[in-house]
């Protein structure tokens, strides 16, 4: 008899990452009989929702349904109809919603309620929308990259699945940069985690991990820029802010009310004699770097050592995967190569920031001015955060790997979140490897 393909015995899962600047939907797929194996879940689709983050819908919650439609419809197309009802959907909201909740639990609840109602209208198995903690965001990012790198597998392989993967089982640290927060997560070397808030204990695949994590709310790239502007405008003599973090010739008008909308600028808030001010770029990396450093309070540390703002940070250990905006920004600046030293990155940033705005616009005609204008700040901020914030050095810089995808799956917290909620990471090593599903009979 002729060989006939059996229906694929696969499962799907959907996670929406409701970030501060945008929402992305991820679809994951895995063989049903290999749920407890490490590295079998992979991403089959990413859909970026058009528009801002959900926290911006406070004044227009009725538009949330339409906002989510395209990506949810895409999920309907990608996932076979027969699988819809058993496909779990999770939405995790991060720092943008943490900030909205800080201002008002009612407004945050209202946004989430409408999101939940919208997502419940689809034929999937909706599991709820919630604001995840900064600790979860860091932990799940760490789980994601180490799962994808095969670090939890007890089988040592003779081959390497990604260029920067080492064959040893030492886990990678995770560096995540968003618009409103940044997370640092890693396993310190024989170091007591002095602050209980920063300590996590995991048992994964039969191995114990003592993990350090911290999420710096307000230190994502967008909120850091708001902080810097609020700090700098305090000492401006008039409504002109000459800003070294923007290209020479760049001009933009900012409303003071927008500047003080976020809790992140609360410490810099003051009564100004104007309602608006104009940013005028002067494009100077060194001055920009100095201005950014003023956002990191390093004068106070109640522990043996700190990152900044009195937050405990153990000595850095091992290799780190830097993803999300760490990757997007450095990729745009063409600085993700393993061969680019920290000194070279600094040199390139100096040149880039000094380029006139008109020249930059001509060089990147396809990039929207709003995003294009901020790469000088973002690149400088990344350097400042990694070097002065997290204490990487010119030598340890080579241990940072700017990662977009690993094996076709995006680095980020969403995969780790789904693996946890679907109980796909066992505490103990599975006793036997399930027989592989034979596709043909």
């Amino acid at each position: 008899t002729q060989n006939k393909a059996l229906p694929e015995n696969v499962k799907y899962g959907i996670v929406l990452d409701a970030g501060s600047s945008h929402t992305s939907l991820y679809i994951y797929k895995w063989p049903a009989e290999k749920e407890n194996d490490t590295g079998v879940v992979h991403q089959v689709e990413e859909c970026r929702v058009k528009g801002p983050g959900i926290s911006k819908f406070v004044q227009k919650v009725n538009e949330i349904g339409i906002y989510l439609t395209d990506c949810m419809e895409r999920a309907r197309e990608v996932i076979p109809r027969s699988q819809h009802q058993e496909t779990p959907v999770y939405l995790g909201a991060t720092a943008g919603m943490r900030l909205l909740r800080m201002e008002s639990e009612e407004l945050a609840d209202r946004v989430l309620d409408v999101v939940e109602r919208s997502l419940s209208n689809y034929p999937f198995d909706f599991q709820g929308a919630r604001i995840i903690t900064g600790q979860e965001e860091g932990a799940y990012g760490w789980i994601t990259i180490n799962y994808l790198l095969g670090k939890f597998s007890q089988k040592t392989r003779w081959f390497s699945i990604v260029p920067y993967e080492t064959n040893n089982q030492e886990t990678f640290g995770a560096l995540d940069l968003g618009g409103a927060s940044t997370q640092v997560t890693f396993v310190p070397q024989n170091q007591t985690i002095e602050s209980p808030d920063n300590a996590l204990q995991f048992r994964l695949y039969g191995k114990d991990y003592n993990v350090y994590t911290h999420s710096f709310l307000c230190y994502g790239k967008d909120q850091a820029l708001w902080q810097k502007l609020a700090k700098d405008i305090q000492v401006a003599s008039n409504e002109i802010l000459r800003d070294p973090c923007f290209h020479p010739g760049y001009k933009k008008v900012v409303n003071v009310s927008d500047l003080y909308k976020t809790p992140c600028t609360k410490r810099f808030e003051m009564t100004l004699p104007f309602q608006q001010f104009e940013i005028q770029g002067i494009g100077n990396y060194q001055q920009c770097h100095q201005s950014i450093l003023e956002l990191f309070n390093t004068s106070y540390c109640p522990y043996s050592q700190c990152a900044f703002n009195g937050i405990f940070l153990p000595p850095l250990q091992g290799d780190f995967g830097a993803f999300s905006a760490f990757y997007f920004v450095m990729k745009f600046l063409n600085l993700t190569s393993e061969k680019v030293s920290q000194e070279k990155v600094t040199e390139m940033m100096k040149k880039f920031c000094a380029q006139p705005w008109e020249e930059i616009k001509t060089s990147y005609p396809a990039v929207a001015a709003k995003y294009l204008s901020e790469y000088c700040f973002s690149g400088t901020y990344i350097l400042s955060l990694l070097l002065q914030g997290y204490h990487f050095t010119a030598d340890s810089w080579e241990h940072i790997h700017f990662i977009g995808k690993i094996q076709g799956s995006d680095a980020g917290w969403t995969l780790g979140y789904m693996l946890n909620l679907t109980n796909m990471i066992p505490a103990e090593q599975p006793l036997s490897t399930p027989l592989s599903h034979s596709t043909y009979v």
């Epitope: 004044q59 008002s104 639990e105 709310l217 809790p263 410490r267 808030e269």
Partner: antibody, heavy 116, light 111 residues
Framework: EVQLQQSGPELVKPGASVKMSCKAS????????MHWVKQSHGRTLEWIGY????????TFNQKFKGRATLTVNTSSRTAYMELRSLTSEDSAAYYC?????????WGQGTLVTVSA | DIVLTQSPASLAVSLGQRATISCRAS??????????MYWFQQKPGQPPNLLIY???NQGSGVPARFRGSGSGTDFSLNIHPMEADDTAMYFC?????????FGGGTKLEIK
């Protein structure tokens, strides 16, 4: 479980200052604002102001501005309120409460008595 | 400042009956489709306890006999059926704008 533990009662002289504390547990301290509320004669509740533990920024009821100072120590997860130039009118129970706009969790209160 | 006028100042209700407390704001406390109105219960020697948030949502662990309603400037708290344990002071609060303000309180007793 969210808990706010306030410091004990204070007996202070007119013109002096008092500093009370509110130790938080059971949640991420920097994710929520901390408010302070005054209650006199077991009836009148007055909002004093709030602090953003994340960065130390604060907002006050104009009535208390200049006389009240709000601070935090994030490593010990503690919020503080100092009241200066005390008069008999300041004799009251002072509460800390966690929230943005919803005061869902309150400390047990610190009773301040201003007396010569 | 938004002034909250609570009435009555005191109220005595028989067990099993309905208690209604009202709170009127000097201007609307609604914003972005949310009513920033809250109701608290306070017993002697204890801090206030959140009963109702957003005008009509029950706080965590609050019995269903406590109901909040209203929008804009007029709000009410209904307790039905009245139980002995409900003897307490009740306060309304607005957090629409700074300074956040409280009503003068209603003393609820058993008749």
């Amino acid at each position: 479980e969210v808990q706010l533990q306030q410091s004990g009662p204070e007996l202070v002289k007119p013109g002096a200052s008092v500093k009370m504390s509110c130790k938080a547990s059971g949640y991420t301290f920097t994710d929520y604002n901390m408010h302070w509320v005054k209650q006199s004669h077991g009836r009148t509740l007055e909002w004093i102001g709030y602090i953003v533990p994340l960065n130390g920024g604060s907002t006050f009821n104009q009535k208390f501005k200049g006389r009240a100072t709000l601070t935090v120590n994030t490593s010990s997860r503690t919020a503080y309120m100092e009241l200066r130039s005390l008069t008999s009118e300041d004799s009251a129970a002072y509460y800390c409460a966690r929230g943005g706009t919803r005061f869902a969790y309150w400390g047990q209160g610190t009773l301040v008595t201003v007396s010569a | 400042d938004i002034v909250l006028t609570q009435s009555p100042a005191s109220l005595a209700v028989s067990l099993g009956q309905r208690a209604t407390i009202s709170c009127r704001a000097s201007e609307s406390v609604d914003n972005f489709g949310v009513s920033f109105m809250y109701w608290f219960q306070q017993k002697p020697g204890q801090p206030p306890n959140l009963l109702i948030y957003g005008a009509s949502n029950q706080g965590s662990g609050v019995p269903a006999r406590f109901r909040g309603s209203g929008s804009g400037t007029d709000f009410s708290l209904n307790i039905h059926p009245m139980e002995a344990d409900d003897t307490a002071m009740y306060f309304c609060q607005q957090t629409k704008e700074v300074p956040y303000t409280f009503g003068g309180g209603t003393k609820l007793e058993i008749k």
